[in-house]
Interface confidence: low
């Protein structure tokens, strides 16, 4: 007998064809011989099957000798052998309905596990293969698991169920809830205003939750909460903020924080956490602040940086349009008795300048000027 695979929730059309190309009497029954539907003249009649108003046919095809059975909103329990009785013949079609669902929710936090569960009719032995949006293939039986979801796992997962040499394809949209960047670093000169942005890597109609920014200043022995806030339908409202520094927060997404000014005592690392309503776990984004200060004290010109810099970063002091006078993989460099002119302090990574601060050194009889 013919085997047809169907998807839970979908519509399937089982065909039944008579040799006579005209409307004649037909009946569709299930394996228990319970009538599903049939015709009486040009009328469609329905039997007492559990398919009820989910069963239909196409009357427009009857005149061509085609008497399909359409089953809407398929359920696993609809898996059965369906018999079409027409012209003293019986056509049997075995319908196997499969369902593939993601564990609890299709919106998962980064780092969580995704479990795909296959619902299948009794007696079937399907195999499943799924392909992630980044091309990773996983195979399994009734359940497939992927641990430690990453941002790249967001998108459409395509799963193929194979049974009786026939296949049915499922597409499941998975949204990995995460910030666009796991970590970011901001480089600022002392005194400049600092902007921190925390864009999300997903969009949902309603976003509700609460968040907090904890800050570990390089100079401090312990971390402290700089700001706590609520998120209601994408509207941000500040619950509590420290007095020093007094952060400002944007009222709309993306989450946006403004530090009034960069100071050495603020340099360090922060961790913004966002707890979303109805989700276990939190979203995290690390943010780092590096602050530069250039000073001249008597006969000493000093350039310093505070905050999390990598050991390969180079700190240099040079007179404008001249070679670097001093260049070190350290957090402070200085020049004794600097000659007059515009000096540049540069923080660079493999030749790329990340931060620059200029200081004008005047002849020894006057005081220095910081532009």
């Amino acid at each position: 007998k013919k085997v047809v695979l169907g998807k839970k929730g979908d519509t399937v059309e089982l065909t039944c064809t008579a040799s006579q190309k005209k409307s004649i009497q037909f009946h569709w029954k299930n394996s228990n011989q319970i009538k599903i539907l049939g015709n009486q003249g040009s009328f469609l009649t329905k039997g007492p099957s559990k398919l009820n108003d989910r069963a239909d046919s196409r009357r427009s095809l009857w005149d061509q000798g085609n008497f399909p059975l359409i089953i809407k909103n398929l359920k696993i329990e609809d898996s059965d052998t369906y018999i079409c009785e027409v012209e003293d013949q019986k056509e049997e079609v075995q319908l196997l309905v499969f369902g593939l669902t993601a564990n609890s929710d299709t919106h998962l936090l980064q780092g969580q596990s995704l479990t795909l569960t296959l619902e299948s009719p009794p007696g079937s032995s399907p195999s499943v293969q799924c392909r992630s949006p980044r091309g990773k293939n996983i195979q399994g039986g009734k359940t497939l698991s992927v641990s430690q979801l990453e941002l790249q796992d967001s998108g459409t997962w395509t799963c193929t169920v194979l049974q009786n040499q026939k296949k049915v394809e499922f597409k499941i949209d998975i949204v990995v809830l995460a910030f666009q960047k796991a970590s970011s670093i901001v480089y600022k000169k002392e005194g400049e205003q600092v902007e921190f942005s925390f864009p999300l890597a997903f969009t949902v109609e309603k976003l509700t939750g609460s968040g907090e920014l904890w800050w570990q200043a390089e100079r401090a022995s312990s971390s402290k909460s700089w700001i706590t806030f609520d998120l209601k339908n994408k509207e941000v409202s500040v619950k509590r903020v420290t007095q020093d520094p007094k952060l400002q927060m944007g009222k709309k997404l993306p989450l946006h924080l403004t530090l009034p000014q960069a100071l050495p005592q603020y340099a360090g690392s922060g961790n913004l956490t966002l707890a979303l309503e109805a989700k276990t776990g939190k979203l995290h984004q690390e943010v780092n602040l590096v602050v530069m200060r250039a000073t001249q004290l008597q006969k000493n010109l000093t350039c310093e940086v505070w905050g999390p810099t990598s050991p390969k970063l180079m700190l240099s002091l040079k007179l404008e349009n001249k070679e670097a006078k001093v260049s070190k993989r350290e957090k402070a460099v200085w020049v004794l008795n600097p000659e007059a002119g515009m000096w540049q302090c540069l923080l660079s990574d493999s030749g790329q300048v990340l931060l620059e601060s200029n200081i004008k050194v005047l002849p020894t009889w006057s005081t220095p000027v910081q532009p």
Epitope: L44, K46, P48, N52, D53, D56, S57, R58, R59
Partner: antibody, heavy 118, light 111 residues
């Protein structure tokens, strides 16, 4: 908002036919089944049948099957119920109805009184 | 056809008291964990108004004084506390199988 507006009252002679209309608005007409329900004066409710406006597939109660035709016109968002070979016991109010989000009839027409009298 | 038998045929309840109407189906109307029974209120000259769907779900805009319960073949509609405005005829209806059928109705009078 969802509205079902039915045609006006009719007086018919026994043996004649009547065609009651039900104009839908406030939603996508082809997305929902339209049902027809009969209520004889002072009596209970009786389901006549239904139509899927998108496909034109209609199903009716065996009790009415030989005398009823349910149709729909997608261009005007209107469903029709025609009852033939009218008898005096067909005197009733005929309602069209539509399901809500659940399985019950959440939306109803105002009803059309059909009187069959010689 | 599934026959639905409502009882009582009529009842009179004092204002603020509880009204209980039962509906017995000729066969189970349960499927896949749901009970396909609905309840309606009808006042003279008006179409019926959906109160409860799938046995216990309150239709939007219906006060919580109305509640439905039951499964299989036995279902109940409760109104508590009864208000003057509740005087009407109440019908149960199964949406489990064609032909859809209604109970014969219960007339509620407020004392």
């Amino acid at each position: 908002q969802v509205q079902l507006v039915q045609s006006g009252a009719e007086v018919k002679k026994p043996g004649a036919s009547v065609k009651v209309s039900c104009k839908a608005s406030g939603y996508t007409f082809t997305d929902y089944v339209i049902h027809w329900v009969k209520q004889a004066t002072g009596q209970g409710l009786e389901w006549i049948g239904e139509i899927y406006p998108g496909s034109g597939s209609a199903y009716s109660n065996a009790k009415f099957k030989d005398r009823v035709t349910i149709t729909a016109d997608k261009s005007t968002n209107t469903a029709y119920m025609e009852l033939r070979s009218l008898r005096s016991d067909d005197t009733a109010v005929y309602f069209c109805a539509r399901r809500g989000n659940g399985t019950g009839f959440a939306y109803w027409g105002q009803g059309t009184l059909v009187t069959v009298s010689s | 056809d599934i026959v639905l038998t409502q009882s009582p045929a009529s009842l009179a309840v004092s204002l603020g008291q509880r009204a209980t109407i039962t509906c017995k189906a000729g066969q189970s109307v349960d499927y896949d964990g749901d009970s396909y029974m609905n309840w309606y209120q009808q006042k003279p000259g008006q179409p019926p108004k959906l109160l409860i769907y799938v046995a216990s779900n309150l239709e939007s805009g219906i006060p919580a004084r109305f509640s439905g319960s039951g499964s299989g073949t036995d279902f109940t509609l409760n109104i508590h506390p009864v208000e003057e405005n509740d005087a009407a005829t109440y019908y149960c209806q199964q949406s489990y199988k064609d032909p859809l059928t209604f109970g014969q109705g219960t007339k509620l009078e407020i004392k």
